[in-house]
């Protein structure tokens, strides 16, 4: 007699996801010499052990305590790039800027990067068919619950000048309702970070307007300036450029702006 | 530079009572609220364990052979993680390690303090 089983109205775990998560873990920590303590078993285990035979609209920051230890990183905190609704462009910069890093740059956040995954209460089993959505079904869920507690890390973390990465072609280029909206922006710390300088990234390749004049981008200001932090704003009007001088700074056209 | 500083180990009899300090300087502790806080031990010839810890968000978690005696709590103005021990036992003897923990910024520990309970 075949099992019931709720249906949720995300897509289910992605195929594969213990092999690719202690896949990744293996090659981050090859990668990076400073990781290569992290014994990647035990940090799948950890991963297992935050949603396994817990019911998938449950799930608490403690859950992921055990894997937040075992995978504590020290990032320099003065070169940290937070990203909305941009984040190819942000890992494409931070692979050129070999010295800033994107949540996705850590371990964590690279284990995690553009997968899914639930368990079911009271059972071993990993749900491949389908996982809670997070306005359909409930907050709380497993994906959820990792990025919020992932992000606000991040953002503790951060000191001096932090940079974000935001997307001028979206309709709110600073939604409230994002990550970095509703976590990161929240626990960034005054006593340790001094500004918080926006890039709005055009698409259009004629878009010559002041982006940074956009009101959601003034209630940004608004809410960093209430939190005793600095703002300030840049247009990066040409993204391919903004790369491409990043990669050769000695250009000669990457003196005018980009 | 950073430190952890354990004071308030000692020798006491079984049944007594200690309280343990963790105070924690350095600008890296600028923000101590976001640090996760922990006593660790470590008996003569076994492994370091967790005793107890406090989140950021205060949620704290116990070993269950100290659940109902331990409590841990922390000062967040002073920079400071405590670990209140009741009704010591001669099992609780060991080297006792304080640990600040955030994801992001770094693991770390304390010298530690000698807990002696005897009669």
């Known amino acids: 007699v075949p099992r019931w089983r709720q249906q949720w109205s995300g897509p289910g775990t992605t195929k594969r996801f213990p092999e690719t998560v202690l896949a990744r873990c293996v090659k981050y920590t090859e990668i990076h010499p400073e990781m290569r303590h992290v014994d990647c078993q035990s940090v799948w285990d950890a991963f297992k052990g935050a949603f396994i035979s817990k019911h998938p609209c449950n799930i608490t920051e403690e859950d992921y305590q055990p894997l937040m230890k075992l995978g504590t990183q020290t990032v320099p905190c003065n070169k940290i790039l937070l990203w909305s609704r941009i984040k190819d462009l942000a890992h494409q910069f931070t692979q050129v800027q070999r010295d800033m890093f994107t949540l996705e740059d850590t371990l964590l956040g690279y284990l995690a990067d553009d997968l899914t995954w639930c368990g079911e209460f009271n059972t071993s089993k990993i749900n491949y068919q389908s996982c809670p959505d997070w306005r359909k079904d409930c907050s709380n869920n497993p994906v959820s619950v990792f990025w919020k507690t992932v992000s606000r890390r991040f953002a503790e973390a951060a000191c001096d000048v932090v940079h974000v990465m935001l997307n001028g072609s979206r309709s709110k280029i600073f939604d409230k309702n994002s990550t970095f909206g509703s976590v990161e922006v929240h626990n960034l710390q005054p006593e340790k970070v001094q500004t918080l300088e926006a890039w709005v990234i055009h698409g259009g390749r004629e878009d010559s307007r002041d982006l940074c004049q956009d009101p959601t981008i003034k209630e940004l200001e608004s809410i960093i300036s209430k939190r005793n932090i600095q703002f300030s704003c840049k247009n990066i009007y040409r993204p391919d450029k903004f790369l491409q001088c990043v990669k050769n700074p000695e250009d000669s056209s990457c003196t005018s702006e980009i | 530079q950073v430190k952890l500083e354990e004071s308030g180990g000692g020798l006491v009899q079984p049944g007594e009572s200690l309280r343990l300090s963790c105070s924690a300087s350095?600008?890296?502790?600028?923000?101590?609220?976001?640090?996760?806080m922990s006593w660790y031990r470590q008996g003569p010839g076994k492994q370091r364990e967790l005793v107890a810890s406090i989140s950021s968000g205060e949620t704290t978690t116990y070993a269950d052979s100290v659940k109902g005696r331990f409590t841990i709590s922390r000062d967040n103005a002073k920079n400071t993680a405590y670990l209140q021990m009741d009704s010591l036992k001669p099992e609780d003897t060991a080297v006792y390690y304080c640990?600040?923990?955030?994801?992001?910024?770094?693991?770390?520990w304390g010298q530690g303090t000698q807990v002696t309970v005897s009669s």
């Open positions: 640990n600040a923990d955030h994801t992001f910024t770094g693991d770390f």
């Open positions: 350095g600008s890296i502790f600028k923000v101590f609220r976001v640090f996760a």
